[in-house]
């Protein structure tokens, strides 16, 4: 029945038309200046995001925002007076004017006109809420802002203290380097003296070979004479023989008594015919002493002994001095072989040493060293080794040169503190060292960050706790 | 945990044999070098053979060498002594034992099983 | 072979006696002896390992030492359940020998 239309005039003001029957009512209202149109949807959750707004923006955002709060109020005061006003002036109008039965057209447009002023009302409310609802999410990051520029401070200040140290460090390695520099001057300057005298020695030994080429000459001379007479002495041996055997009363009285075999290593062993892996006996150097001991015969052409597994953490390697001399654990799993065997063992003849890693990720890696030896207990069984070759790093995780053997209780290190206790195992520690493959055995998940684990730093860095781990020495001459 | 269990004990003639058995469990048969040590009724204990863990290497003293054999089945985690040629004086307690790893002490033993050997 | 001389051969002590039975080798064998308790009817039971090793569960009254030929096994305070025989053994070298055994009787 009413026909109630909306639209702009050219000067930008809202036109209400009322069409009821014959007449038509027309309301001009004014516009708002600063109120977001139509085209522009406000977003009421702006301000929730992840990241944090820029302060500057922030605080501009929320003078935009008062300023249109403060706009709205002035406009619906302008929309009541102006209500107001026009009801007024309508009213004397349509008194004077209109037939009776406008009146109740009239009402109903006042209706219309007051329940658009609470649709306004109740939208400046909805408004009023959301600048609240940013207002306490800015207070909530100006105060995160703050918090974390703090945290920021502070680690500024950790790292700040941290790279002091480290320039502490340099100067003293710089230092290092260069004695070391001073130290290879001599050495080389030693070595071409040294050069020197060789030459010398090669000229006095050339005159030697000459001297023995000469008397060569003259032994094959004597020599046919005494092949001549072995052949004399060989006719007369044979007649014996000969008449020794007419004789033939008794037998041979003499037995062959069983000999015990003995190996001195796993190389030994597989020289046998000995092939396949296992516990095996071997029997100390010019002793009759025995040991047990797993072989490889099979890794790199097999022969190879093992001193050192570490697989499970089934074995504790915290032991005394006499336990790491001795050796301790099973053959079969986890055991250190023993560090008196071990020394009398590469003090014989030449030996390598292999050290075969492995992670808790499936790699693999080798050390492999071209000469290893022990010094004796004397000396704590140092360890010597020369010519590093392998894919667990191009750096030597043993320092070098050679350390004193400590255990926790026989600390040999160059650390005021007592590395083996720190780091837990028998080790050649140095202050502590890169290396440390009898430490804490720490399952998976649980294997970093530990400063007392299987480590070998120059494959895995320093807090990486490795999975398993084997030492096994061979004859360089295999 | 660890167990030893001899049997095949009893009486037998001079110049018979007999074939002594040790049931082991509680650990990884394989992985150990295992023993025979006896014991004469009111004498001290004496070692009797020793094998590896492959069975390739067997050791004997000179008392019962050429004698006495001893031998292992890692499949069934059994440790047998045959024992031939008996004389009197191999009459014992026969235990079967089990080292620590690198060196013969010996950790575990069985309860035993007498050889009786008489006529 | 090396042999194994246990002495005494037997002893009569009494409870919170401190005793002290000595072995000796006939050829050096470092620290590589072993010592075992039997009582009647049973098998052996490892005391000490590596001349002063004490095995797993053997109480502190039980103290081994000695190295090279000489070695002594010592109970601070002989208490009931001591009383049986004991044995060293060398675990040098194969053949691996007993001593004859020493018998701790009560007093």
């Known amino acids: 029945y009413n026909n109630f239309r909306k639209s702009m005039d050219s000067i930008g003001k809202k036109q209400y038309q009322v069409q009821h029957g014959s007449c038509s009512y027309t309301f001009l209202l004014p516009e708002m200046d600063n109120c977001r149109s139509s085209s522009s949807p406000y977003v009421s959750n702006a301000v929730q995001r992840d990241a944090p707004l820029e302060y500057d923006d922030s605080v501009q955002r929320l003078q935009v925002l008062e300023n249109i709060m403060e706009n709205n109020t002035q406009w619906l005061m302008k929309l009541e007076n102006y209500i107001q006003d026009n009801m007024k002036k309508e009213m004397v109008e349509i008194q004077q004017n209109a037939v009776q039965n406008q009146t109740a057209v009239m009402i109903e447009i006042g209706t219309n006109l007051l329940n658009q002023t609470a649709e306004q009302t109740r939208k400046l409310t909805d408004v009023e809420a959301q600048v609240l609802n940013q207002t306490t999410r800015l207070e909530l990051q100006l105060l995160e802002h703050s918090l974390s520029t703090n945290k920021l401070e502070k680690q500024i200040l950790d790292q700040t203290s941290e790279i002091n140290k480290l320039q502490d460090k340099n100067s003293f390695l710089e230092k290092k380097v260069l004695a070391m520099e001073d130290k290879h001057i001599i050495q080389l300057q030693s070595i071409k003296e040294e050069k020197d005298q060789l030459q010398v020695l090669v000229s006095k030994q050339n005159s030697i070979i000459e001297e023995l080429e000469k008397k060569i000459v003259t032994a094959t001379v004597n020599n046919s004479v005494l092949q001549k007479q072995q052949h004399d002495l060989m006719e007369t041996v044979n007649n014996l023989l000969t008449m020794m055997s007419t004789s033939n009363s008794a037998k041979d009285p003499t037995v062959a008594k069983e000999e015990q075999i003995s190996f001195r290593d796993c190389a030994e062993v597989f020289k046998s015919g000995h092939t396949t892996n296992g516990i095996y006996t071997l029997t100390f150097p010019n002793s009759t002493e025995e040991i047990k001991a797993y072989c490889d015969m099979e890794a790199g052409g097999g022969g190879w002994t093992i001193i050192q597994r570490r697989e499970d953490g089934s074995v504790d390697f915290q032991r005394t001095w006499k336990e790491y001399k001795v050796g301790f654990g099973n053959p079969s799993g986890e055991y250190w072989l023993g560090n008196e065997f071990v020394s009398q063992l590469t003090n014989q003849q030449r030996y390598v040493l292999k050290i075969h890693l492995k992670d808790w990720e499936g790699n693999e890696a080798y050390s492999l060293y071209e000469h290893f030896y022990l010094s004796s207990e004397e000396l704590n069984y140092r360890i010597h080794l020369k010519g590093l070759t392998g894919t667990a790093g191009k750096i030597s995780s043993i320092s070098q040169p050679g350390n004193d053997f400590s255990t926790k209780d026989g600390d040999n290190d160059k650390c005021i503190c007592k590395c083996s206790q720190m780091l837990t195992g028998g080790w050649w520690f140095d202050a502590c060292g890169p290396s440390n493959l009898n430490g804490m055995y720490y399952p998976q998940r649980q294997n970093t960050n530990k400063f007392n684990g299987i480590k070998w730093y120059y494959w895995k860095g320093s807090g990486y706790s490795l999975k398993a781990t084997t030492m096994m020495i061979r004859p360089a001459d295999f | 945990q660890v167990q030893l269990v001899e049997s095949g004990g009893g009486l037998v003639k001079p110049g018979g044999s007999l074939r002594l058995s040790c049931a082991a469990s509680?650990?990884?048969?394989?992985?150990?070098?295992m023993y025979w040590v006896r014991q004469a009724p009111g004498k001290g204990l004496e070692w009797v053979a020793t094998?590896?863990?492959?069975?390739?290497?067997?050791y004997y003293p000179d008392s019962v060498k050429g004698r006495f054999t001893i031998s292992r089945d890692n499949a069934k985690n059994s440790l047998y002594l045959q024992m031939n040629s008996l004389r009197a004086e191999d009459t014992a307690v026969y235990y079967c034992?089990?080292?620590?790893?690198?060196?013969?002490?010996?950790?575990?033993w069985g309860q035993g099983t007498l050889v009786t050997v008489s006529s | 072979d090396i042999q194994m001389t246990q002495s005494p051969s037997s002893l009569s002590a009494s409870v919170g006696d401190r005793v002290t039975i000595t072995c000796k080798a006939s050829?050096?064998?470092?620290?590589?002896v072993a010592w075992y308790q039997q009582k009647p009817g049973k098998a052996p039971k490892l005391l000490i390992y590596?001349?002063?090793t004490r095995h797993t569960g053997v109480p502190s009254r039980f103290s081994g030492s000695g190295s090279g030929t000489d070695f002594t096994l010592t109970i601070s305070s002989l208490q009931p359940e001591d009383f049986a025989t004991y044995y060293c053994?060398?675990?040098?070298?194969?053949?691996?020998?007993f001593g004859q055994g020493t018998k701790v009787e009560i007093k």
């Open positions: 034992a089990r080292d620590w790893g690198l060196r013969p002490w010996f950790v575990y």
């Open positions: 509680g650990f990884t048969f394989s992985d150990y070098y």
């Open positions: 094998i590896s863990v492959g069975g390739s290497f067997t």
């Open positions: 050829q050096d064998v470092s620290t590589a």
């Open positions: 590596w001349a002063s």
């Open positions: 053994q060398q675990h040098y070298s194969t053949p691996p020998t």
